[in-house]
Structure formats: structure tokens, C-alpha cells
């Protein structure tokens, strides 16, 4: 139903606390450089305005769209041009163009210092002084670094953060209580951010159909007992919610997400028995619980897929009459039977099936043409299975750090034009997938690996789009969302790349490396490794092993020496010469 005042309607639905949090997230995601105090001032102004509209929905400006109200607020900031440059040009546009313009200025990689965690004592002091302000600061710091973070989920993590502090700030050993809790929240929140970013990229770059297909596959795996019609209903609502959040309409998104959770709880009998434990929880926890829900057991006695999708003489007729419904049904039926497959695999299989029907249904005897379709789709299953098996074997053999090094070499050979820090960052991220997934049972390994890789490659693609350096990366990123991972896997040494001239600076180390934390030490060594590959992209595995071995021995020797700097100064050039000889 239409409301006289949209902002009053959302204020009433969400309540003041969540309303203020979402307004703060909205502002922080769009105005990533502004200080916290400025945002707090604007949040209070917007909240006061919303309260006035609740009191009188006919009051001046209360009938305006929320996006317009936000745009007007932003455009009224006096320092907008000097702080944000050309973002201020958006203010000359009319909505909805102005909204689109703001969206295009969101920065996925803002030049902000890492979000450092203060010492537990300092944390607790600040929290006790003013816990609302403290949690507001958390929302602000996360939102400005993650401009597409799923806003209602961020409210959930802020609640978790608040609960951890409430409990641990009373503990005798605050650090022992807080550290594991905050580490767990951080790790989960980072994954949540990456997942939402992929959803937004899917909608923005590949369209609604791509996102809906992704959702059908995921929900069919989670709720295999639900009918296709029920899955379709949820997917339609979920698409609306996701579009709203990706578009920056966070109040609408959070409200509609609440509605979706309510709908699912009211219809849990026809969706999943696992919903019971979620539906008794309060709003934020309920929606989060549904998002993270364990998959339901498969219904027994499911007929063979071939019955409806190969043997049935009506396949082409059904395909012609309602292509998307028929393919959606195929994806649903396939996904609910295969919870162990990744979303990417399921979508590639559905795409393969669609391509086969496109070809066969145009023939005089379609059935003869598509009769062996499932045999022909088998490579789409075998390829990722084999890849995961090989990579997990390598991970088990080398450990996380060694596996990251192998990936650093592999990805530098694939895209040597990419900057060294970026290659190291992605090699490390890709390597950590081994830690996350390789220890899992066989049935979960495949989906874990490919689903995580999709998140990492999406981030790579987003940053590469901002400053493109490699045509091959652009091609893999833009041609097809579901084929990104296979596309990157299929890249080998870039034959067009002209090796980088040798710079001794890239391989010169000083005593300060000895005192660095282990992680930073690894990063320094991996930077040198990447530089080495850029210098000799076709070096053999044996040559690389030798050089890395010499390098590790050099670092150990000099870091153990009494006069470390002298050792680095004297032995460094010798090591460089030896490496050059090995790689010659």
C-alpha cells in the first residue's frame, strides 16, 4: 500500500534505534571521507525530520522519496566539493540520475588506514563512557571501508559487538574474553561483506536474471523440501531486498528484509523444518539465522532428473512455452539434489543444459540430439572436482604459507601486469581458502572452495575494473559471472608479457625484517617472489625452489647474526648474484 510519507512509514516499521543505525550506514557508505561527528549531526537532523513526519505525514517535504531526501541532505553539505571533488557534480542532476551518480562514486578501495582495534582497556573505557556512540563509531568505520556491506546484517554484527563488550568489559581478563569474540565477529563480517559485494556485482554487471538464478540454486540447496513455486516467491522478494540494499536504499531494504523473514516464518511448514529455531529469535537475529541456516535434509524418493528433462517428449515444448520457468525448474531440481556442488557449478550445468536445448530444439529430432545431455555435462562436474583435489593435495603438502607461494607464482604468470602488492594480497587470500576448505569432509570441500573463490575473484575484478592493467583479467571478469573461476584457472603463462628488467632494489633487505611480525615477514618475502616471477615468468619450479631456499637461508643467517645489518649489507648482493645465475 502507498504511504503518504515514506520516511515516516520506515521509521515506524524499523524503530528509532535501527532507523538511526541505517541512516548512519547510508551516509558513511556514500561519504566515506567525512568525519564521524559530521555524520552524527546529519543522522540527528534526519531522525528529527522523520519524527516530525510521523507526527504529521502531510508536513512539508514528508511526501518526498527517501532517496531524494538523502540526496538533498548530501548536496547541502558546504564542503562537499572540496572533500569529494566531482561527486558534487551529481547534485546538478535530477533523481533518479542523481542517485545513480552517487552510487558510481562509491569507492571499493578507499584510501583509509586499516581499522585498528584499540587495547581492551581503552575499548572498555570508551564503551562504558557512551555505548551508543561507541557502536555508532563501529558502524561508521565498517561502512566507510565496505560501502556495499549488507546494512541490516551490519546492524546484527554491531549488536554482537555490543554484547561481547557488555560481557567482557566486566571480566577479570578483558583481553582473554574479548580477543576471540571480536576476531570471530571480524572474520564473519568480512565474509559477509564479500558475499554482499558479489550479489551487488551480479545485479549491477550481469542483471536480475543472473542474480535470480544464483538465488534459486542457493535456496534450492538449503530448502530441498520446498516446492519450486515457494522458492520462486522467496527469490522474488530476496531480489527486491538485495536490489534495494545494493542501490543504497537501506531503510527500504531493512524493512523489506524483516517482511521476508516474517513471511518465511509464517510459511515454515512449506519451506524447511530448520526454520523453527530461527523464528523464535528477535528481528535482527532471526534474519541472520535464516541467512546462515543449515540445509534441510533431502526428501526421499526424488525421481531421476532425466525423467522430466531428457526422457519427456515435451521438453522443447516446455522450453518454448516458458523458457525461464522451465530452466528455473531444472536449476531447482538439480540444486536440491546436489547440496555438495558449488553455486557456480550448478549455474554452469544449467547454462550447459540451456545451450544444449537451444541447439537441439531447433533440430528435426530434438530428442535424439539431447538424449545424452547429462553425459555431455559431466566435464563441468569433473573439472572443479579434479582441481579441488589437486589443490588440496598441494595445500596438505606445502602448508598455508607454501601454498600461498605456489599461488603467487601461478597468478603472477597468469597476469604479470597486475601490481605486486595486489598479486600478493590475492595469493594470500586464495591460499587461505585451503585452510578454510581442505580440512572439510569431501561432501563440503567442493562448494566451500568454489564459493570462496567466487568472492575473492569478484573483489579482484572490482578493483581491476577501477584500474585495468590486463586484458586477460578484464576478459575473465566481464564475459560471464559463472565462468570467472574456470576462466582464471584456464589462464597459463602470459606469452605477450615482456619480462621486467632486473632491479636489485626489489631484492634488497635490511635488518628491520627480522623484527617484523610473522605475517608481515611473509608478505615481504612474497613480494620478492612475485618480483622474481615478473623478471623470469618462465622459470621452472626447480629454479624457483632453489632461489626460495637460498633466500630463506640468507634471512635466517642474517637474522641470527650479531651484527644483522652488516650481514644484510654483505650477503645481500651475493644472494642477488646467485639468484640471477640460478635463473639465467
Amino acid at each position: 500500500e502507498a504511504h503518504k510519507s515514506e520516511i515516516a512509514h520506515r521509521f515506524n516499521d524499523l524503530g528509532e534505534g535501527h532507523f538511526k543505525g541505517l541512516v548512519l550506514i547510508t551516509l558513511s557508505q556514500h561519504l566515506q571521507k567525512s568525519p564521524f561527528e559530521e555524520h552524527v549531526k546529519l543522522v540527528n537532523e534526519v531522525t528529527d525530520f522523520a519524527k516530525a513526519c510521523v507526527a504529521d505525514e502531510s508536513a512539508q517535504n514528508c511526501g518526498k522519496a527517501i532517496a531524494t531526501l538523502f540526496g538533498d541532505k548530501v548536496c547541502a553539505i558546504p564542503s562537499l566539493r572540496e572533500t569529494y571533488g566531482e561527486l558534487a557534480d551529481c547534485c546538478a542532476k535530477e533523481d533518479p540520475d542523481r542517485v545513480e551518480c552517487f552510487l558510481q562514486h562509491k569507492d571499493d578501495n578507499p584510501n583509509l588506514p586499516p581499522f585498528e582495534r584499540p587495547e581492551p582497556e581503552a575499548l572498555c573505557t570508551a564503551f562504558k563512557e557512551n555505548n551508543d556512540r561507541f557502536i555508532g563509531h563501529y558502524l561508521y568505520e565498517v561502512s566507510r571501508r565496505h560501502p556495499y556491506f549488507y546494512a541490516p546484517e551490519l546492524l546484527y554484527y554491531a549488536e554482537k559487538y555490543k554484547n561481547a563488550l557488555t560481557e567482557c568489559c566486566e571480566a577479570a581478563d578483558k583481553a582473554a574474553c574479548l580477543t576471540p569474540k571480536l576476531d570471530a565477529i571480524k572474520e564473519k563480517a568480512l565474509v559477509s561483506s564479500a558475499q554482499q559485494r558479489l550479489k551487488c556485482a551480479s545485479l549491477q554487471k550481469f542483471g536480475e536474471r543472473a542474480f535470480k538464478a544464483w538465488s534459486v540454486a542457493r535456496l534450492s540447496q538449503k530448502f530441498p523440501k520446498a516446492e519450486f513455486a515457494e522458492i520462486s516467491t522467496i527469490v522474488t522478494s530476496l531480489t527486491k531486498v538485495t536490489k534495494e540494499c545494493c542501490h543504497g536504499d537501506l531503510l527500504e531494504c531493512a524493512d523489506d528484509r524483516q517482511e521476508l523473514a516474517k513471511y518465511m516464518c509464517e510459511h515454515q511448514d512449506s519451506i524447511s523444518s530448520k526454520l523453527k529455531e530461527c523464528c523464535v529469535k528477535p528481528t535482527l537475529q532471526k534474519a541472520h539465522c535464516i541467512l546462515e541456516i543449515q540445509r534441510d535434509e533431502l526428501p526421499t524418493e526424488l525421481p531421476d532428473l532425466a525423467v522430466d528433462f531428457v526422457e519427456d517428449k515435451e521438453v522443447c515444448k516446455n522450453f518454448a512455452e516458458a523458457k525461464d520457468v522451465f530452466l528455473g525448474t531444472f536449476l531447482y531440481e538439480y540444486s536440491r539434489r546436489h547440496p555438495e556442488y558449488s553455486i557456480g557449478m550448478l549455474l554452469r550445468i544449467a547454462k550447459g543444459y540451456e545451450a544444449k536445448l537451444e541447439k537441439c530444439c531447433a533440430e528435426a529430432d530434438p530428442h535424439a540430439c539431447y538424449a545424452k545431455v547429462f553425459d555431455e555435462l559431466q566435464p563441468l562436474i569433473d573439472e572443479p572436482k579434479k582441481l579441488v583435489q589437486q589443490n588440496c593435495e598441494l595445500f596438505d603438502k606445502l602448508g598455508e604459507y607454501g601454498f600461498q607461494n605456489a599461488l603467487a607464482v601461478r597468478y603472477t604468470q597468469k597476469a604479470p601486469q597486475v601490481s605486486t602488492p595486489t598479486l600478493v594480497e590475492y595469493a594470500r587470500k586464495l591460499g587461505s581458502v585451503g585452510t578454510k576448505c581442505c580440512s572439510l569432509p569431501e561432501t563440503e570441500r567442493l562448494s566451500c572452495t568454489e564459493n570462496y573463490l567466487a568472492l575473492i575473484l569478484n573483489r579482484l575484478c572490482i578493483l581491476h575494473e577501477k584500474t585495468p592493467v590486463s586484458e586477460r583479467v578484464t576478459k575473465c571478469c566481464t564475459e560471464s559471472l559463472v565462468n570467472r573461476r574456470p576462466c582464471f584457472s584456464a589462464l597459463h603463462v602470459d606469452e605477450t608479457y615482456v619480462p621486467k628488467p632486473f632491479h636489485a632494489d626489489s631484492f634488497t633487505f635490511h635488518a628491520d625484517i627480522c623484527t617484523l611480525p610473522e605475517k608481515e615477514k611473509q608478505v615481504k618475502k612474497q613480494m620478492a617472489l612475485v618480483e622474481l616471477v615478473k623478471h623470469k615468468p618462465k622459470a621452472s619450479e626447480e629454479q624457483m625452489k632453489t632461489v626460495m631456499g637460498d633466500f630463506a637461508a640468507f634471512l635466517k643467517k642474517c637474522c641470527d647474526a650479531d651484527n644483522k645489518e652488516a650481514c644484510f649489507t654483505e650477503d645481500g648482493p651475493k644472494l642477488v648474484a646467485k639468484c640471477q645465475a640460478t635463473l639465467a
Epitope: 515444448k317 518454448a320 512455452e321 530444439c361 533440430e363 529430432d365
Partner: nanobody, 115 residues
Amino acid sequence: DVQLVESGGGVVQPGNSLRLSCAASGFTFTSFGMSWVRQAPGKGLEWVSSISGSGSDTLYADSVKGRFTISRDNAKTTLYLQMNSLRPEDTAAYYCTIGGSLSRSGQGTLVTVSS
């Protein structure tokens, strides 16, 4: 919505000819092979003939081979069945279908061959 409208049926004497048409709409006609099926009074559906989307490939049931010719006009999104040397056993309701489907979508057109 997909629509298939058959026409051209009638009553003819054995040995005579008829040309059936099927006007198709609501789907990408050129992307689909099309078929003719028929149903004699009191019998099940029987496949008669099929043609590929481009019109280059055709298939016929043994009972009509050499007598019937299937064709299509993709510009007009219309399917045809030219029936020569008709026999009493060709008496049936004729339906055009998408792909190799053996179900009726349109209303069909009745062909009666009798002396």
C-alpha cells in the same frame, strides 16, 4: 503466450490432396523444430513429420513417407503439411507441435478422407 492455430483441413476423396497450415506466435519460431501429429478417432496421438528450425532437415513416419511434405516459412512463422495421395487411414485431427512433442497445443484441424 505460445499460440498454434491449425487450418486447411476438410473432406476429400482418396487420392486427392490437401495443404495444412499452422500459424505460430509467442515464441522464437526459428529456434524450434516443429512437428505434425495426428489423432484418428478413438486412437492415441501418432507422430507424422518433423522439420528443423532452419527448414533444412525433415523426418517422416513410414506411413506417410513419399506422400506428405513438411515445410515452413520462417518469415511468416507458419508451418505447412502438403498431403498428396490421401488414403482413408489418413483420416484424423492434425495438430502442429513444438519440437518432438506428442501433445496437442492448438485446436487442430480435421481431415476426412472418404469416397
